[in-house]
Amino acid sequence: KEEQTTFRDCAEIFKSGLTTSGIYTLTFPNSTEEIKAYCDMDVGGGGWTVIQHREDGSVDFQRTWKEYKEGFGSPLGEYWLGNEFVSQLTGQHRYVLKIQLKDWEGNEAHSLYDHFYLAGEESNYRIHLTGLTGTAGKISSISQPGSDFSTKDSDNDKCICKCSQMLSGGWWFDACGPSNLNGQYYPQKQNTNKFNGIKWYYWKGSGYSLKATTMMIRPADF
């Protein structure tokens, strides 16, 4: 049997026998275009493609539509994988989304959605989510039904205020909604009473900016 040489996601890499977490090269569906991603092969059975990570504020997340489309940052640290790749990937098969959160008091929580996909760019990478479970709130901190993605130069939210400009970062803003994991990073002791921080309302409430976040996806049938 010929060995697989291209992989569409980290689950395929894991199943090929490569089970160490790290940076791997993925290939766009139905294309030869490649992208580098961090694969988490340890959490919950492994095979997770990390699509977002925040940990120290080293990367500026107040980026343009094009940058959020194509991705930015470093897969070894803070980064955004890219809306176009995630849209194409999640449009082909059913994926689950796991969001891991850390606060500044040493607590961790997660939200797991049993079906996640992004619409195409023509629909502003609108997010679709169903089936929430987990410890980071019984109500979804990503507004339901899903919103279009907005950035500082592409305002697609439901607010007259331009949420991305006001709150910082590209996100699926409603008007503006209960979350923004791409907000301004605030260090410890400066992370409360912040209107534009890294927000997940149904875990930490208003004005609390989180220490670390990871968004990762995996095929539902993994």
Epitope: K158, I160, C161, M166, P178, K194, F195, Y201, S206
Partner: nanobody, 130 residues
């Protein structure tokens, strides 16, 4: 430092009136929304009313429409909630909260959702006796 200080609560008989005040300072916004919320013992906090500093647009919960009036004095950085025809079911701790100018495009009103407010006061108690 952002501060929201409520005052004006107290004990009043059913059918009476109270005026709550919310003094606001240090907000990091040019335009903003101030909301009034209330929480009765053993119940969820609920949005009562809100007002936008930029255009004065307002929202009222159905339970207080026609009885409560929200207003603002921008010169004093104070928002008021005039509460008339009070009922025993209005008994609660009343909180004012502040957030950015999150005005919904569809409704053109401010939000009654807690998560749209970033800063909160300590609350003032309103008790309506029958």
């Amino acid at each position: 430092e952002v501060q929201l200080v409520e005052s004006g609560g107290g004990l009043v008989q059913a059918g009476g009136s109270l005026r709550l005040s919310c003094a606001v300072s240090g907000l990091p916004f040019d335009d903003y929304v101030i909301g009034w919320f209330r929480q009765a013992p053993g119940k969820e906090r609920e949005g009562v009313s809100c007002i936008s500093s930029s255009d004065g647009s307002t929202y009222y919960a159905d339970s207080v429409k026609g009885r409560f009036t929200i207003s603002s004095d921008n010169a004093k950085n104070t928002v008021y909630l005039q509460m008339n025809s009070l009922k025993p079911e209005d008994t609660a701790a009343y909180y004012c909260a502040a957030g950015g100018p999150r005005i919904n495009i569809a409704t053109m009103t401010c939000s009654h959702d807690e998560y749209e407010y970033d800063y909160w006061g300590q609350g003032t108690q309103v008790t309506v006796s029958s």
